[in-house]
Amino acid sequence: DAISSGDDEDDTDSSEDFVSENRSNQRAPYWTNTEKMEKRLHAVPAANTVKFRCPAGGNPTPTMRWLKNGKEFKQEHRIGGYKVRNQHWSLIMESVVPSDKGNYTCLVENEYGSINHTYHLDVVERSPHRPILQAGLPANASTVVGGDVEFVCKVYSDAQPHIQWIKHVEKNGSKYGPDGLPYLKVLKHSGINSSNAEVLALFNVTEMDAGEYICKVSNYIGQANQSAWLTVLPKQQAPVREKEITASPDYLE
């Protein structure tokens, strides 16, 4: 079944969902509760939570994997990832967006066989929505001391976005406040008529400028943020590209 609420339901009806292993009764996977799987097409409003279930049994206890549109479904394939609750044979996606639309297949396998079941998810867009940031931006960058660098944050928002560029900083020699959250400094922010707020330009950089830069975008509905790292190299070293890392801003200075 699929739910579309903001809270993950506790599965209290799972008496048949998890079948204990018995060596003398080996068998291929089988569905234990087909009623929960009858509804294949799910149209869910954006921002809601979706749960797909494939309650199964077998001996030995089968493993479960999920495919999206016939391909392995990885955590990095969606913002916020997803949860798999193996004991409840469920896939949970919170705050669904249009890009989550598609076919979701549970693949249940053990050494004696394999079964699968496919759900189709349609996300009904409720506009306006919180900002969406283009994947991969801002991109990690490196430059030599004295060089210039530009970070770009591409924003899609159908309500007026407020853009902030934020950097982790130290205060009294500490990177973290008394509450354990990092100190953050707003380097640039947009006003209603601000132009080019999507670009943060740094000139004549020093080693002090190295670190994580966060593009944080808010509209009246919600927020989104992505980050990139700046590596500052000694003048004799050539720039290198680094793998992107994301983080969430917590503590504004």
């Epitope: 609420s5 903001g6 921002a47 309500a159 808010s218 509905i221 927020q223």
Partner: antibody, heavy 113, light 106 residues
């Protein structure tokens, strides 16, 4: 179904403080700003401020800084507003709203000695 | 802050009549929202992003405008449309509402 359920009518003395709640269900509470709106009897609507439950970010209308304090408990999907140093001017209906299209039923506050 | 001025403050219309009310902003805006409120009820979103109809709102309601001038139109007035209508801007802090237009049925 999305629901925002606000706490009931409050009667308070001048100078006192009150706390009202807005319990939500049916959507991902942490992902959306929760706005608070004031409406005095027979008057228009005023934006007090908003809280983003995911990280605790808060924006206040300058007019209500020091008067209103916004908080949220994500585990309970509930937003709160404290109003302090109450005067007759604070007598109003207070609404919580998320996304602009989801509204609570309002909490009526009457300040009277 | 951006001041929104609605006009007229009060108006009346007969069933079937076309109704237009306006909202003027003290500074240019990207978008405008419109709400309907009936006595004893919470505001109800009618129009977002200037011209988009909110879920469940009858198609007789429409919104238009840009910059500093916006309007809400009801193509054919119905008795249930008697209410107070507010414009609101979500573009600039502090977010602000207009003073409202009270629409009565003749």
């Amino acid at each position: 179904e999305v629901q925002l359920h606000q706490s009931g009518t409050v009667l308070a003395r001048p100078g006192a403080s009150v706390k009202m709640s807005c319990k939500t269900s049916g959507y991902t509470f942490t992902n959306y700003w929760m706005h608070w709106i004031k409406q005095r009897p027979g008057q228009g609507l005023e934006w007090i401020g908003a809280i983003y439950p995911e990280n605790g970010d808060i924006n206040y209308n300058q007019k209500f800084k020091g008067k209103a304090k916004l908080t949220a408990v994500t585990s309970a999907s509930t937003a709160y507003m404290d109003l302090s140093s109450l005067t007759n001017e604070d007598s109003a209906v207070y609404y919580c709203t998320s996304r602009g299209d989801y509204w609570g039923q309002g909490t009526t506050l009457t300040v009277s000695s | 802050q951006i001041v929104l001025t609605q006009s007229p403050a009060i108006m009346s219309a007969s069933p079937g009549e076309k109704v237009t009310m306006t909202c003027s902003a003290s500074s240019g805006l990207s978008y405008m929202s419109w709400y309907q409120q009936k006595p004893g009820s919470s505001p109800r979103l009618l129009i977002y992003d200037t011209s988009n109809l909110a879920s469940g709102v009858p198609v007789r309601f429409s919104g238009s405008g840009s910059g500093t001038s916006y309007s809400l139109t009801i193509s054919r007035m119905e008795a249930e449309d008697a209410a107070t209508y507010y414009c609101q801007q979500w573009s600039s802090y502090p977010y602000t509402f207009g003073g409202g237009t009270k629409l009565e049925i003749k």
